[in-house]
């Protein structure tokens, strides 16, 4: 049984490592697989001190634990390297940290990236 | 640290029906998708269903199909698996399994045994 | 029906290396399919040794180690010890919410 599944066609692209791994540095990719697979977007940051630094976002294969998200959220408690997946085209261009295992507010607010 | 507790197995006869449970701790249980594997005696590991972080989206092996039904509890943190027309092939251990990033298990429960005879 | 084949059973001396493979019916193996791996002995749990191809769960040897070998996933034990003797499980997610798992290796540590 599925609920109200979006499909992802694309997700915004970002590599902070785009020199080294010879790739573009920021766009939009198209996300490809098999037909019988599911696509999704994802992004990965770190918080230095404070400031926010992405890593990468993109296209991630199909992978149950970003079924049903339409908003990429990290809810993990303090990770070391922040990780977020969705569907819905482009759905990482905007991507947030909210930890459920305080009961307080939100520590910080939903980061829109300016790569 | 991470517990599944699986609980509800038993013995039941052939058409019956049985509903187990694993009880989830350690961990935000409403962030991860969850499974159920099971293993007949002697046999090998064979997955039977899994469950997606809300729940709209569940998933069976073909042969349990119509018969049994995942669901989970978020507010409970506890995953069930309803089993219903029961038959001897269904005898076996049932793990949960709490799946990660990258669609794999990486923390399983003791299991429950599940007995169906007449 | 996708069939995830292994190698039934496999022996090794203490301290030589083995390879398990883990294939599928319908084509080749890549780390699209996320190959994990798992070790079982008799009326344990199943125990997490490898995922996402090639990552070594926490607290694995890394004695242990995933691959991709040809058309196939592949778990190698190098410097095998008697208390790896056990049942290994590989395990492929196909997509959509469904995993197929092997029939699992049978693991002889020799002496």
């Known amino acids: 049984a599925i609920l109200g599944r979006s499909e992802t066609q694309e997700c915004l692209f970002f590599n902070a490592n785009w020199e080294k791994d010879r790739t573009n540095q920021t766009g939009v990719e198209p996300c490809y697989g098999d037909k019988d697979k599911r696509r999704h977007c994802f992004a990965t940051w770190k918080n230095i001190s404070g400031s926010i630094e992405i890593v990468k976002q993109g296209c991630w294969l199909d992978d149950i634990n970003c079924y049903d998200r339409t908003d990429c959220v990290e809810k993990k408690d303090s990770p070391e390297v922040y990780f977020c997946c969705c569907e819905g085209n482009m759905c990482n261009e905007k991507f947030s940290y909210f930890p459920e295992m305080e009961v307080t507010q939100p520590t910080s607010n939903p980061v829109t990236p300016k790569p | 640290e991470v517990q599944l507790l699986e609980s509800g197995g038993g013995l039941v006869q052939p058409g019956g029906s049985l509903r187990l449970s694993c009880a989830a701790s350690g961990f935000t249980f409403r962030n991860y998708a969850m499974s159920w594997v099971r293993q007949a005696p002697g046999k090998g590991l064979e997955w039977v269903s899994g469950i997606s972080v809300t729940g709209g989206s569940t998933y069976y092996t073909d042969s349990v199909k119509g018969r049994f039904t995942v669901s989970r509890d978020n507010s409970r943190n506890t995953l069930y698996l309803q089993m219903n027309s029961l038959r001897a092939e269904d005898t076996a251990v049932y793990y949960c399994a709490k799946v990660y990033y990258s669609s794999f298990f990486d923390y399983w429960g003791q299991g429950t045994l599940v007995t169906v005879s007449s | 029906q996708t069939v995830v084949t292994q190698e039934p059973s496999f022996s090794v001396s203490p301290g030589g290396t083995v390879t398990l493979t883990c294939g599928f019916n319908s084509g080749s193996v890549s780390t699209s399919y996320y190959p994990s791996w798992y070790q079982q002995t008799p009326g344990q749990a199943p125990r997490t040794l490898i995922y996402n191809t090639n990552t070594r769960s926490s607290g694995v040897p890394d004695r242990f180690s995933g691959s991709i070998l040809g058309n196939k996933a592949a778990l190698t034990i190098t410097g095998a010890q008697a208390d790896d003797e056990s049942d290994y499980y590989c395990?492929?997610?196909?997509?959509?919410?469904?995993?197929?798992f092997g029939g699992g290796t049978k693991l002889t540590v020799l002496g």
């Open positions: 395990v492929l997610y196909m997509g959509s919410g469904i995993w197929v």
